[in-house]
């Protein structure tokens, strides 16, 4: 028995508006009905929780109202979008998946997605 496998892209470049999207896919060993997905950020030897959501299979992913994350689920795949990113938010974003119900509980952690965020250059002042 090994840890549940979680796949995510190695690298993602955020858009000029500070939005990054990636897919987190897990190989479910059973028929989970309740799944918890957490996005963690590791940078400079610090680990912080970016956002987390618990969802019932077949239902929408619901993050807290003030969360910078949104997402949708389809089978064993979660499409995650993180917004409001700035250059200082560049780092390794790790997808953690927990199969909460029914038992047995399983935990899987992806190898991380390096998200690069480049702050847009300010527009030059216009003479018009």
């Amino acid at each position: 028995c090994k840890a549940m496998h979680v796949a995510q892209p190695a690298v993602v470049l955020a858009s000029s508006r500070g939005i990054a999207s990636f897919v987190c896919e897990y190989a479910s060993p059973g028929k989970a009905t309740e799944v918890r997905v957490t996005v963690l950020r590791q940078a400079d030897s610090q680990v912080t929780e970016v956002c987390a959501a618990t969802y019932m299979m077949g239902n929408e992913l619901t993050f807290l109202d003030d969360s910078i994350c949104t997402g949708t689920s389809s089978g064993n795949q979660v499409n995650l979008t993180i917004q409001g990113l700035r250059a200082m938010d560049t780092g390794l974003y790790i997808c953690k998946v927990e199969l909460m119900y029914p038992p047995p509980y399983y935990l899987g952690i992806g190898n991380g997605t390096q998200i690069y965020v480049i702050d847009p250059e300010p527009c030059p002042d216009s003479d018009f």
């Epitope: 549940m4 509980y105 952690i109 190898n111």
Partner: nanobody, 127 residues
């Protein structure tokens, strides 16, 4: 699936020793980091120590007093606690995390990466 069971808590006098055990069933320990954490009343759960195949890491507050080890043949991780102090009083938990290539000495014990938490065992240091 992994199932962890810990044992070894109890009441001990200041300066005394205790050994906690965390036994795994359902899986070999090999692909996992095993961590010890503790939570005192009214405080957040904090890292004590963790171990993978080749590395160990300790919280500053226990360095030199606590030793973590693993016995792969018995599928068990031990936490030897010496020179115990009143401030070590807490509920101690064992947990597991899949060992990942991006873990560093500073992050491999981070509680965010862990699951399979045990119920906890009480350690009380008092005279």
């Amino acid at each position: 699936e992994v199932q962890l069971v810990e044992s070894g808590g109890g009441l001990v006098q200041p300066g005394g020793s205790l050994r906690l055990s965390c036994a795994a069933s359902g899986s070999t320990l090999d692909p996992f980091v095993i961590g010890w954490f503790r939570q005192a009343p009214g405080k957040e759960r904090e890292t004590v120590s963790c171990i993978n195949r080749s590395r160990t890491s300790y919280a500053d507050s226990v360095k030199g007093r606590f030793t973590i080890s693993r016995d792969n043949a018995k599928n068990t991780v031990y936490l030897q606690m010496n020179s115990l102090r009143a401030e070590d009083t807490a509920v101690y938990y064992c947990a597991a995390s899949p060992d990942k290539p991006f873990y560093t000495d500073q992050t491999m014990c981070n509680k965010h990466y862990y699951g399979y938490w045990t119920q906890g065992t009480q350690v009380t240091v008092s005279s």
